[in-house]
């Protein structure tokens, strides 16, 4: 199963270590994450062609997943630390419905499924922590989120394969931007 | 279930027109993004034209664009291909699909859960 920040065999035998920072138990968790996304998307590009022909086998896309834009103060200009932040939080927790979807998604990789998962989890709570202004956060509608599972489970088998490979994509540019700007605060 | 029955098809000469219909017995037709596609004996189906839900946005394979144009009328049940300046290769078995996605809009036909029976054109040159 894979092992989670901060638990790896290296911590373990180095107990004098400083203990990270903040921001790098952040940076860490991201990269984390990053990695096991990697590995769902080998399985799913493996199992399918759905990863190269996307483009032309789909004429809209309608799956509403959090994307970065000049407006949330995440990119180099305009970057607004504030703004930014409440951002990645909230696309994080927009992340989840999707996130819980890719579960039963694997066959090989159920755990790294459910690891991204609960990585996620706790990434969300660090950056929580972090934020000065959470009142700006939107949750998502738990009732929303439960019709909007139903629906994505009742898709048909090639509908799905390519839902998970479009969550799987756009979770993946989601947090490389995240981590692009959480290293400019 | 849905049931999708086609009509329209025919023989035309080149030049000439063809407006095919897809009927659906679906109670929720609506949330269904339909589309059509065409065979001809010994190749693939091959995609030739979608619509979304709404029918806001249609889209069709680069050999039917610009005499093509795939519509939809929600309060009918019906999807419909309007086709003009018909060319010989155009001759093939017309099928309606309909996908119950909700999300996506296929342009292949795996993305599809329910297909017509097929109506045949031919275009004589």
């Known amino acids: 199963a894979p092992v989670p920040p901060g638990e790896d065999s290296k911590d373990v035998a180095a107990p004098h270590r400083q203990p990270l920072t903040s921001s790098e138990r952040i940076d860490k968790q991201i990269r984390y994450i990053l990695d096991g996304i990697s590995a769902l998307r080998k399985e799913t590009c493996n199992k399918s062609n759905m990863c190269e022909s996307s483009k032309e086998a789909l004429a809209e896309n309608n799956l509403n997943l959090p994307k970065m834009a000049e407006k949330d103060g995440c990119f180099q200009s305009g970057f607004n630390e504030e703004t930014c932040l409440v951002k990645i939080i909230t696309g994080l927790l927009e992340f989840e419905v999707y996130l819980e979807y890719l579960q039963n998604r694997f066959e090989s990789s159920e755990e790294q499924a459910r690891a991204v998962q609960m990585s996620t989890k706790v990434l969300i709570q660090f950056l929580q922590k972090k934020a000065k202004n959470l009142d700006a956060i939107t949750t998502p509608d738990p009732t929303t989120n439960a019709s909007l599972l139903t629906k994505l489970q009742a898709q048909n088998q090639w509908l799905q394969d390519m839902t998970t490979h479009l969550i799987l994509r756009s979770f993946k540019e989601f947090l490389q931007s995240s981590l692009r700007a959480l290293r400019q605060m | 279930q849905v049931q999708l029955v086609e009509s329209g098809g025919g023989l035309v000469q080149a030049g000439g027109s063809l407006r095919l219909s897809c009927a659906s017995s679906g109670r929720t037709f609506s949330s269904y993004v339909m589309g059509w596609f065409r065979q001809t004996p010994g190749k693939e189906r091959e995609f030739v034209s979608t619509i979304n839900w709404s029918g806001s946005n249609g889209y069709y394979a680069d050999s039917v664009k610009g005499r093509f144009t795939i519509s939809r009328d929600n309060a009918k049940n019906t999807v419909y291909l309007q086709m003009n300046n018909l060319k010989p290769e155009d001759t093939a078995v017309y099928y309606c699909?309909?996908?119950?996605?909700?999300?996506?809009?296929?342009?292949?036909?795996?993305?599809?859960?329910?297909w017509g029976q097929g109506t045949q054109v031919t275009v004589s040159s």
């Open positions: 699909a309909a996908s119950a996605g909700g999300f996506l809009v296929p342009r292949v036909g795996q993305g599809y859960d329910y």
